[in-house]
Interface confidence: medium
């Protein structure tokens, strides 16, 4: 498919000018190659009329130019003094005419309307309002006022001052007679339809002394604005419909076959399933304007979009509308990245987020898409060292691997983490990408103890068990903080005995904290990576308490921090009952509630009475040190 894009149809009137913009991928080759505008012949072939290399056909001499805008990836063809002979099929393209790097454009030049003398022309957009002014003389001040529409050879009454309204105009027309001082009546027609276009006649009085005035109403279908975006990128449609529809429901729809326009999103809460997780309808303003952001653009998103206002939240005759023609360039500069990432409950995910590599210094963000209230995306983490409070200890944004990609790690997963997340930067807004996290059944691969208590001044050793499948990966321990996870020294203790059917390639890697201080309290992660690419992680919260008895602590999966209210299972794993120490931020009445979420958005401040092995992997018992 050609990556060149332009207007499919251009309509104009004899004597007028047109300006045709064609888009191309702004690669360095494309920027400098020949641009052309040619007319398609009846037997194929395309005869150049104008090109960027200076050629101008005699037919266009003195009335056309072609300008390249390499920084935008566009070129513009201007043609003046149009005649009906200019109607036809054209191509705008790059390189040589026959190569196929082009876009077909149909140009239609029509005769101007043959208007009667003394005809006032009203040109109004579809869905808008027109006021037709009709002057009269004093002798007709008390006589009937009327407006007729010329249908074929006959004038058909539209409205009059005695109260008649033509059924085609019911509910959207009125006749106003100005105060006695002004010899003028006006007819106001709202929610204009294409079928309203035509010749009208105002009349005051019905006899030979009546006053008459001709009006020509032209109802314009909005010309679609051309939008050229990259596959996997994003688009924003800004819709400004005017203050008169500020309180009317708004919609964005995509035209399918014929006149059908399928709602993509509206302010009444409707959203097309194909756009779930990748669309935001930004709140409308008093002036009736709003915008819609769509990310993760797909090939099938290309097409004509209309935004409008109607109480039904969908396109109806007479809706004021704005139009766009979206072209999705498949020669995208945005790299492929997984659109779905699967994680096991209790385990973790590492999400790769692409960004424009020219903007390596931009701030990176990650947000969670919410479908409520027309879609919004509360930020969870950024590259400046901020993490939303409910995600402390389990979420990190890393600048690695760099060069156009950053990494987000989320661990201690539960079913509530399933959903759509957006990768953002404060730079190029077209590089907004979406990833869906799905939570699947299974066991975490890494095994760590549940929450651990260290004693001030003593030594603590915390184990992390890696199965054989990670034998070729680098294994690490790190201490989590708002800015990332700082690597710590760790010791390989040899094969692990925590896995059934796992050979010598399994590994037990320990973190040792010598002479524990208060500063050692916090979240620790063990994980695997290959170079700058991160894999699974597991988290452990280490609490620090005053010395009770001398010695050092070697925490194993069994009996880790065993307290009087914990029972050790035969399996060698521990089960923590609902009496375990809770996150101090939780209110007393929440303490025993299983699987609670802080403000329903992501904290795991609960005690699950799941399997002991689940607990070993998920580390859900939060102890925060603020």
């Amino acid at each position: 498919k050609s990556p060149i894009f332009g207007p499919e149809e251009v309509n104009s009137v004899e004597g007028n000018s047109v300006s045709i913009t064609c888009y191309y991928p702004p690669t360095s080759v494309n920027r400098h190659t020949r641009k052309y505008w040619c007319r398609q012949g009846a037997r194929g072939g395309c005869i150049t009329l104008i090109s960027s290399e200076g050629y101008v056909s005699s037919k266009y001499a003195g009335r056309a130019n072609l300008t390249n805008f390499p920084e935008n990836g566009t070129f513009v063809v201007n043609i003046a003094q149009l005649s009906q002979d200019d109607s036809g099929r054209y191509k705008c393209g790059l390189g040589i005419n026959s190569r196929g790097l082009s876009f077909d454009v149909s140009l239609e030049v029509s005769q101007g309307p043959g208007l009667l003398n003394d005809t006032k022309v009203y040109t109004v957009d579809l869905g808008r309002t027109v006021t037709i002014n009709c002057p009269f003389k004093t002798e007709n001040a008390q006589k009937r006022k009327s407006l007729y529409k010329q249908i074929g050879l006959y004038p058909v009454l539209v409205i009059d001052s005695s109260g008649y309204v033509n059924p085609n105009y019911t509910g959207r027309i009125r006749l106003d007679i100005q105060g006695t001082g002004q010899l003028l009546f006006s007819v106001v027609i709202n929610q204009l339809r294409l079928s309203d276009a035509g010749q009208y006649l105002c009349q005051a009085g019905d006899d030979s002394n009546s006053n008459k005035k001709n009006a020509d109403l032209q109802v314009l279908k909005p010309e679609p604005e051309l939008v050229y975006e990259d596959l996997r990128g994003s688009v924003t449609f800004h819709c400004a419909l005017g203050p008169e529809v500020a309180n009317v429901a708004k919609f964005l729809c995509r035209q399918s076959s014929g006149e059908n326009c399928d709602v993509v999103v509206n302010t009444l809460g409707k959203r097309a399933p194909a756009f779930e997780g990748r669309i935001l309808l930004n709140p409308q303003d008093k002036d009736g304007s709003f915008s819609v952001v769509i990310t993760g653009l797909r090939k099938e998103d290309a097409g004509r979009y209309l935004c409008g206002a109607h109480s039904d939240g969908q396109l109806q005759e007479g809706s004021p509308i704005q139009a766009w023609q979206l072209f999705v360039n498949e020669e995208s500069t945005i790299p492929r990245s997984p659109t779905v990432v699967k994680g096991v409950a209790g385990s973790s995910v590492a999400v790769l987020c692409p960004y424009n590599r020219k903007e390596s210094k931009s701030i990176k963000y990650w947000c969670l898409w919410e479908g409520a209230q027309n879609g919004r995306c509360p930020l969870l983490v950024d590259s400046e060292g901020w993490v939303k409070a409910q995600y402390e200890g389990r979420l990190s944004l890393l600048e690695e691997p760099g060069n156009g990609t950053f990494t987000v790690i989320l661990n201690q997963l539960t079913s509530r983490d399933a959903g759509f997340y957006w990768c953002l930067t404060n730079g190029d807004t077209l590089w907004r990408t979406t990833v869906e996290i799905k939570i699947i059944e299974g066991e975490p691969n890494l095994k760590v103890p549940g929450n651990v208590t260290a004693v001030l001044g003593e030594t603590l050793k915390v184990p992390c068990h890696f199965p054989c499948k990670f034998s070729s990966y680098e294994k690490y321990w790190c201490k989590w903080n708002n800015t990332g996870c700082q690597a710590l020294p760790s010791q390989d203790e040899g094969p692990s005995k925590a896995f059934v059917n796992c050979d010598e390639n399994s590994r037990l890697v320990s973190l040792t904290l010598n002479l524990v201080t208060r500063a050692d309290e916090g979240w620790y992660w063990c994980g695997v990576k290959q170079g700058h690419f991160y894999g699974e992680t597991a988290a452990v919260y280490v609490a620090v308490e005053e010395r009770k008895a001398a010695g050092s602590r070697d925490v194993s999966l069994a009996k880790a921090d065993a307290a009087p209210d914990e029972k050790v299972l035969d399996s060698g794993f521990r089960e923590i009952e609902n009496k375990a120490i809770q996150d101090p931020r939780l209110f007393a009445e929440e303490k025993a509630v299983a699987d609670t979420r802080d403000q329903a958005d992501g904290s795991r401040a609960s005690v699950d009475s799941g399997s002991s092995e689940e607990q070993g992997g998920s580390s859900r018992h939060h102890h925060h040190h603020h």
Epitope: T236, L280, N282, P283, D285, S291, V293, I363, Y365, C367, G375, R376, C377, P378, L379, D382, E384, W386, K388, W422, L424, N426, G427, T429
Partner: nanobody, 124 residues
Framework: EVQLVESGGGLVQAGGSLRLSCAAS????????TGWFRQAPGKEREFVAR????????DYADSVKGRFTISRDNAKNTVYLQMNSLKPEDTAVYYC?????????????????WGQGTQVTVSS
């Protein structure tokens, strides 16, 4: 969370100008969509202007369009409201607010961080 501090308020004659500043600490302000709101005595707090994190998208209440300009200097971690052709009806406490929602534009409900406010009085 970000802490916001407004300054630049004061007493000014009708037709005069003021420039309000909103300085952020605790976090870079360009994470946020930032807005100015105002509240006159006995009235509800109303939206005045807002600017997105890149500074490329701004929006104004009808009553201040053409007179007020919102801008940001991310290097100084500050958002400004330049108020020209002030009218007595502009008298109010002006608040700066930040939102950690990504939605291009945000509404009042989305502004989670608020400053203490600065008094602007326009005399006739």
């Amino acid at each position: 969370e970000v802490q916001l501090v407004e300054s630049g308020g004061g007493l000014v004659q009708a037709g005069g100008s003021l420039r309000l500043s909103c300085a952020a600490s605790g976090r870079t302000i360009n994470t946020y969509v930032t807005g100015w709101f105002r509240q006159a005595p006995g009235k509800e707090r109303e939206f005045v202007a807002r600017i997105d994190w890149s500074g490329s998208s701004t929006d104004y209440a009808d009553s201040v369009k053409g007179r007020f300009t919102i801008s940001r200097d991310n290097a100084k971690n500050t958002v400004y409201l330049q108020m020209n052709s002030l009218k007595p009806e502009d008298t109010a406490v002006y608040y700066c607010a930040g939102s950690a929602y990504y939605s291009g534009y945000v509404t009042h409900r989305d502004f989670g961080s608020w400053g203490q406010g600065t008094q602007v009085t326009v005399s006739s």
